[in-house]
């Protein structure tokens, strides 16, 4: 196994809809033709999954059905989308890459994206 | 909040072998810096491995090297240290020890660990 650095940015606001994107981008150092990324959430000294996807180089990532994540890649970059957000979601977002094929197997971690959710005010009622 | 608990001690004839595990309960070790100490009567605790985050840096004490092995067991949540060739000097009391670093240093191994066990006693002798 080999180290590999990645690249994301440090803090993102997420939308008053609970939307927040950003950009991995991944220094591969040969011609990777399948890579998983994963996006871990790190709060109260515990590290769980969020999403994970595994695509071959030129096509669309592709996640669950049911996940919160969304994605397109370009060459060695990734961006990420993380749908409904919610204030109590607020944490340290990890991009993790892996080139999984052709061999070395190389494994990359990012330093984390602080994403910041706050909740939507709720309308006041109105008379008209 | 996470507590860890060793288990895999007890007595055994030098040249034996012993497999300590490290569990967590109320949460997992993921990508945590997990450290083996031990203490023996009258000495001072002494770091004898740990193992990053990531599970690729493992980091040995001399007076173990070539003999201990530490690794990671994501599946079962556990942390395993894998003694063999025991001598009588390896008798002390096992403590395993964590800490979630930043992701930055997920490949490293942690200066100083948060979190410690109740230990568990290694006892060589014929």
């Known amino acids: 196994c080999k180290a590999m650095h990645v690249a994301q940015p440090a803090v993102v606001l997420a939308s008053s809809r609970g939307i927040a994107s950003f950009v991995c981008e991944y220094a591969s150092p040969g011609k990777a033709t399948e890579v998983r990324v994963t996006v871990l959430r790190q709060a109260d000294s515990q590290v769980t999954e969020v999403c994970a996807a595994t695509y071959m180089m030129g096509n669309e990532l592709t996640f669950l059905d049911d996940s919160i994540c969304t994605g397109t890649s370009s060459g060695n970059q990734v961006n990420l989308t993380i749908q409904g957000l919610r204030a109590m979601d607020t944490g340290l977002y990890i991009c993790k890459v892996e080139l999984m094929y052709p061999p070395p197997y190389y494994l990359g971690i990012g330093n984390g994206t602080q994403i910041y959710v706050i909740d939507p005010e709720p309308c006041p009622d109105s008379d008209f | 909040e996470v507590q860890l608990v060793e288990s895999g001690g007890g007595l055994v004839q030098p040249g034996g072998s012993l497999r300590l595990s490290c569990a967590a309960s109320?949460?997992?070790?993921?990508?945590?810096?997990i450290g083996w100490f031990r203490q023996a009567p009258g000495k001072e605790r002494e770091e004898v491995s740990c193992i990053s985050g990531t599970g690729l840096r493992t980091n040995y004490a001399d007076s173990v090297k070539g003999r201990f092995t530490i690794s990671r067991d994501n599946s079962k949540n556990t942390v395993i240290l894998q003694m063999n060739s025991l001598r009588a000097e390896d008798t002390a009391v096992y403590y395993c020890?964590?800490?979630?670093?930043?992701?930055?240093?997920?490949?490293?191994?942690?200066?100083?660990?948060?979190?410690w066990g109740q230990g568990t006693q290694v006892t060589v002798s014929s």
């Open positions: 109320g949460g997992t070790l993921d990508y945590w810096s």
């Open positions: 020890t964590g800490k979630l670093l930043h992701p930055s240093l997920w490949s490293a191994c942690a200066n100083e660990y948060d979190l």
